[in-house]
C-alpha cells in the first residue's frame, strides 16, 4: 500500500508482508549488485563482508517480543535502514561513471530501488500495526518520536573502509529481513490467533 | 506557533567560513530531520543539506561535501550550517527547513525567512 | 542527479482562469507506488510555502483551487481559477533520491 492507505483484510495484508520481505532477503537485489559495483566482487575481498553483530535484531529476539512488539521494532528498524540506504546511495558511482567502467547499470537501478520498497514494507507494518490496534506507531508520513540510533559504523575517510561496512550492513539487512519472513509465516489466519 | 529563525549570515571574504544557526520553537524538534536550502539573489532554489532527527546521518549536496558540515543540538533546539572554504558562489539567502513525510524521502513545510550570506572581497 | 525541466518560464493568465505549470524530471521521480514529488510557492521576499506534497496531496491550509496529478517522470500544478494573490513563483522539487532538486521556477503573471 502506498501513501498511507491501509488494506483492513488481515490476510491480504499478512499476504503483502511476507512477499515484500522474501523479496528483500533475496541477495541479488541489493547486497550482489553493491559488491559488483564497488568492485568488491573478489573471493578474498568478500570474505571480509561479514554481518557486524548486534546490527540488527537476531530472530530468537524477534519471536520473543510478540506481535505488536515485533511491529514496533521492525517499524523502527526500518526507519534506520532508510537511512543506512540513502547513505550508501550518496556515495555510489554515478550512472555515467558505471558506464565508463563498463559497469551494469542495472546494478545501480536495483541499488535505487531497494528505499522505496522498505518504505512500502513500512508503511503495511504500519498498517498492521493499526489492524492489530497498535496506536503506538506514528503513522508512515508523519514525523516519528525520532529514528532510534543505530550502531553508527565509525566515520573513516577510507573509502575502501566504507565499502566493507556498506557490504556488511547489507548483508546483516538481508539475514534481518530473513528473520522478519520466518517470523510472518508463524503468524496466524487471524488477527486474534498466533502458531508458535 | 511553529518557528524557524536564521541567524549568522553576513559579508565574508573567499576563502573564509561562517557558521549559520537556526533556532527551532513551537514543536519537538528532536522529532524531525532538518535542512538547509538556499536562494542566490533572483535565482532558484537549491538544497544544500540535510541531517537526521538524532542527527547520526547526514546528506549533502556534492559541491558543498567536504567544504559545509551541517549539525544539531537537539537540547538546544538549534541546527547549524559551519561553511568554510566559501566561494563566491555560495552567495545566497540560506534558509532552515522543517523535513517532513516519508524517512528519507521528506519534503519541507515550515521555512525560516533566511540569512543571507554574501561571499565577495 | 535529476535534473528538474520546469515550463513554462512565464505564465500570463486571466483572473479567473485556469493556470497550468509543468515539470519533467530526467529520470522518474515515482517508485514502489510513490511519487516523490512536491509543489512550492514563494512569493517576493518571502520564503517558499508547500502547496502540493507527493505529487496530489493538498497541503493543509492551501485552498483547493491548488492541485497536483502526474506520476513518473512528468507532473503538473493545476490552478483553477487564478486569483490576484497566485500571481507569483511557483517551483517543483523532487525527494526521490539525494540530492533533492528543485525546478527553476514559473513566474506566474497576469494577463
Known amino acids: 500500500a502506498a501513501m498511507g492507505s491501509c488494506s483492513k483484510e488481515y490476510r491480504m495484508l499478512l499476504g503483502q508482508l511476507q512477499k515484500q520481505t522474501d523479496l528483500m532477503q533475496d541477495t541479488s537485489r541489493l547486497l550482489d549488485p553493491y559488491i559488483r559495483i564497488q568492485g568488491l566482487d573478489i573471493p578474498k575481498l568478500r570474505e571480509h563482508c561479514r554481518e557486524s553483530p548486534g546490527a540488527f535484531p537476531s530472530e530468537e529476539t524477534l519471536r520473543g517480543l510478540g506481535r505488536r512488539g515485533f511491529l514496533q521494532t521492525l517499524n523502527a528498524t526500518l526507519g534506520r535502514v532508510l537511512h543506512r540506504l540513502a547513505d550508501l546511495e550518496q556515495h555510489l558511482p554515478k550512472a555515467q561513471d558505471l558506464e565508463r567502467s563498463g559497469l551494469n547499470i542495472e546494478d545501480l537501478e536495483k541499488l535505487q530501488m531497494a528505499r522505496p520498497n522498505v518504505l512500502g514494507l513500512r508503511n503495511n507494518v504500519y498498517c498492521m500495526a493499526q489492524l492489530l490496534d497498535n496506536s503506538d506507531m506514528t503513522e508512515p508520513t508523519k514525523a516519528g518520536r525520532g529514528t532510534p540510533q543505530p550502531p553508527t559504523p565509525t566515520p573513516t575517510s577510507d573509502v575502501f573502509q566504507r565499502k566493507l561496512e556498506g557490504c556488511s550492513f547489507l548483508r546483516g539487512y538481508h539475514r534481518f529481513m530473513h528473520s522478519v519472513g520466518r517470523v510472518f509465516s508463524k503468524w496466524g489466519e487471524s488477527p486474534n490467533r498466533s502458531r508458535r | 506557533e511553529v518557528q524557524l529563525v536564521e541567524s549568522g549570515g553576513g559579508l565574508v571574504q573567499p576563502g573564509g567560513s561562517l557558521r549559520l544557526s537556526c533556532a527551532a520553537s513551537?514543536?519537538?524538534?528532536?522529532?524531525?530531520?532538518m535542512s538547509w536550502v538556499r536562494q542566490a539573489p533572483g535565482k532558484g532554489l537549491e538544497w544544500v543539506a540535510t541531517?537526521?532527527?538524532?542527527?547520526?546521518?547526514?546528506y549533502y549536496l556534492d559541491n558543498v561535501r567536504g567544504r559545509f558540515t551541517i549539525s544539531r543540538d537537539n537540547a538546544k533546539n538549534s541546527l547549524y550550517l559551519q561553511m568554510n572554504s566559501l566561494r563566491a558562489e555560495d552567495t545566497a539567502v540560506y534558509y532552515c527547513?522543517?523535513?517532513?513525510?516519508?524517512?528519507?524521502?521528506?519534503?519541507?513545510?515550515?521555512w525560516g525567512r533566511g540569512t543571507l550570506v554574501t561571499v565577495s572581497s | 542527479d535529476i535534473v528538474m525541466t520546469q515550463s513554462p518560464d512565464s505564465l500570463a493568465v486571466s483572473l479567473g482562469e485556469r493556470a497550468t505549470i509543468n515539470c519533467r524530471a530526467s529520470?522518474?521521480?515515482?517508485?514502489?507506488?510513490?511519487?516523490?514529488m512536491h509543489w512550492y510557492q514563494q512569493k517576493p521576499g518571502q520564503p517558499p510555502k508547500v502547496l502540493i506534497y507527493?505529487?496530489?496531496n493538498l497541503e493543509s491550509g492551501v485552498p483547493d483551487r491548488f492541485s497536483g496529478s502526474g506520476s513518473g517522470t512528468d507532473f503538473t500544478l493545476t490552478i483553477s481559477s487564478l486569483q490576484a494573490e497566485d500571481v507569483v513563483v511557483y517551483y517543483c522539487?523532487?525527494?526521490?533520491?539525494?540530492?533533492?532538486?528543485f525546478g527553476g521556477g514559473t513566474n506566474v503573471e497576469i494577463k
Open positions: 507527493y505529487a496530489s
Open positions: 527547513a522543517r523535513d517532513v513525510g516519508h524517512t528519507t524521502f521528506w519534503y519541507f513545510d515550515v
Open positions: 529520470k522518474s521521480v515515482s517508485a514502489a507506488g510513490y511519487n516523490f
Open positions: 541531517i537526521s532527527d538524532g542527527g547520526s546521518f547526514t
Open positions: 513551537g514543536f519537538t524538534f528532536s522529532n524531525y530531520a
Open positions: 522539487l523532487h525527494s526521490r533520491e539525494f540530492p533533492f532538486t
